[in-house]
């Protein structure tokens, strides 16, 4: 129930002491290193790890990717799986843990020694000459945004939406992914079922923009076979 959710959070996630500062949003506060709020653990363990159902990598955590749990299993059932470490087999970048990427079916390091050239073999665009390193906490696919240095414009190759400029998302286009515009009000959108059927999409659409959601178009004049058309509509 909602109450149990809220009560559990009231225990686990306590804000800083109120002390009257709340009326002054200009000041910032953060958890000091080593301070744990009741029930909170800054260094989250995965002892109680529960596989989470997903439809795409972006629904998973930064150390996970979305796939069928069994090799050759039902493509309709996907969960978030732990990312693959260096030298493990992979089929796409998202399968590799942060600081790595998928090259020739193997997860390899994306540190500055290997970084240049290797990725440019897999992404055929020029992204400048600066040699950036990846910090250990970055999302594995911020590897691409750190490589590009400027956010990808429409049509740029990307790995994740965070690689793309504001107003764009990273979506499949044939067998690669490119930055495409986030959908505006009235534009046709794809309402994904939880089973992850859109993994088969060749031309993936972006999600709806801020303040919009993908809902069935309530147009009674449409033919019955197109009555399932979804468009981006105001909340």
């Amino acid at each position: 129930t909602l109450n149990s959710v809220l009560n559990s959070n009231a225990i686990k996630n306590l804000p800083p002491p109120l002390g009257g500062a709340a009326g002054h949003p200009g000041s910032a506060v953060s958890a000091a290193p080593g301070i744990l709020y009741p029930g909170g653990n800054k260094y989250q363990t995965i002892d109680n790890y529960q596989p989470y159902p997903c439809a795409e990598d972006e629904e998973c955590g930064t150390d996970e990717y979305c796939a069928s749990p069994t090799r050759g299993g039902d493509a309709g059932v996907q969960i978030c799986l732990a990312c693959r470490k260096r030298r493990k087999r992979c089929m796409r970048h998202a399968m590799c843990c942060p600081g790595n990427y998928c090259k020739n079916g193997i997860c390899v390091s994306s540190d500055q020694n290997h970084f240049r050239g290797e990725i440019e073999e897999t992404i055929t665009e020029s992204f400048g000459n600066d040699h950036s390193t990846l910090d250990g906490y970055s999302r594995r696919t911020t590897l691409s945004s750190k490589m590009y240095h400027t956010k990808g414009q429409e049509g740029s190759v990307c790995l994740r939406s965070s690689d793309c400029a504001s107003g764009l998302c990273c979506a499949r286009h044939f067998w690669s992914k490119i930055c495409k515009p986030v959908l505006k009000e009235g534009q046709v959108c794809t309402k994904h079922r939880r089973k992850g059927s859109h993994g088969l999409e060749i031309f993936q659409r972006c999600y709806c923009g801020e303040g919009l959601s993908c809902r069935i178009q309530k147009d009674h004049h449409q033919a019955s076979n197109s009555s399932r058309l979804h468009t981006c509509q105001r909340h």
Epitope: N9, K42, Q44, Y52, G61, T62, S162, Y207
Partner: nanobody, 125 residues
Framework: EVQLVESGGGLVQAGGSLNLSCTAS????????VGWFRQAPGKEHEFVTG????????YYADSVKGRFTISRDNAKNTAYLQMHSLKPEDTAVYYC??????????????????WGQGTQVTVSS
């Protein structure tokens, strides 16, 4: 380490709207979950809404569903909370919080370890 600063709070009449922002400093924001919590006078703080690192997943408490919208722009290190059709019972101090999003779970179940100072939202009848 992530530092969070909320803005956009204020006084509004019932039925009105407010837009809160939560701006983060620190490189970890784009790989962090973000949640909005609130605490009304004399009440326990409650989880209002959350969004995962990519924006692909969101969660809303029943009390705000259909009225509040959470979003984020990782390029700007900012999360947003659009609040419409506000009610007097929405009056509270609103906190933005974040935590590492390494392993997916229900957005109400994350450990939110970094907190903003809070911004006051007052809805008058």
């Amino acid at each position: 380490e992530v530092q969070l600063v909320e803005s956009g709070g204020g006084l509004v009449q019932a039925g009105g709207s407010l837009n809160l922002s939560c701006t983060a400093s620190g490189s970890a924001f784009s790989s962090s979950v973000v949640g909005w919590f609130r605490q009304a006078p004399g009440k326990e703080h409650e989880f209002v809404t959350g969004i995962n690192w990519s924006g692909a997943r969101t969660y809303y408490a029943d009390s705000v569903k259909g009225r509040f919208t959470i979003s984020r722009d990782n390029a700007k290190n900012t999360a947003y909370l659009q609040m419409h059709s506000l009610k007097p019972e929405d009056t509270a101090v609103y906190y933005c919080a974040s935590g590492r999003d390494r392993y997916a779970r229900d957005l109400s179940e994350y450990e939110y370890v970094w907190w903003g100072q809070g911004t006051q939202v007052t809805v008058s009848s």
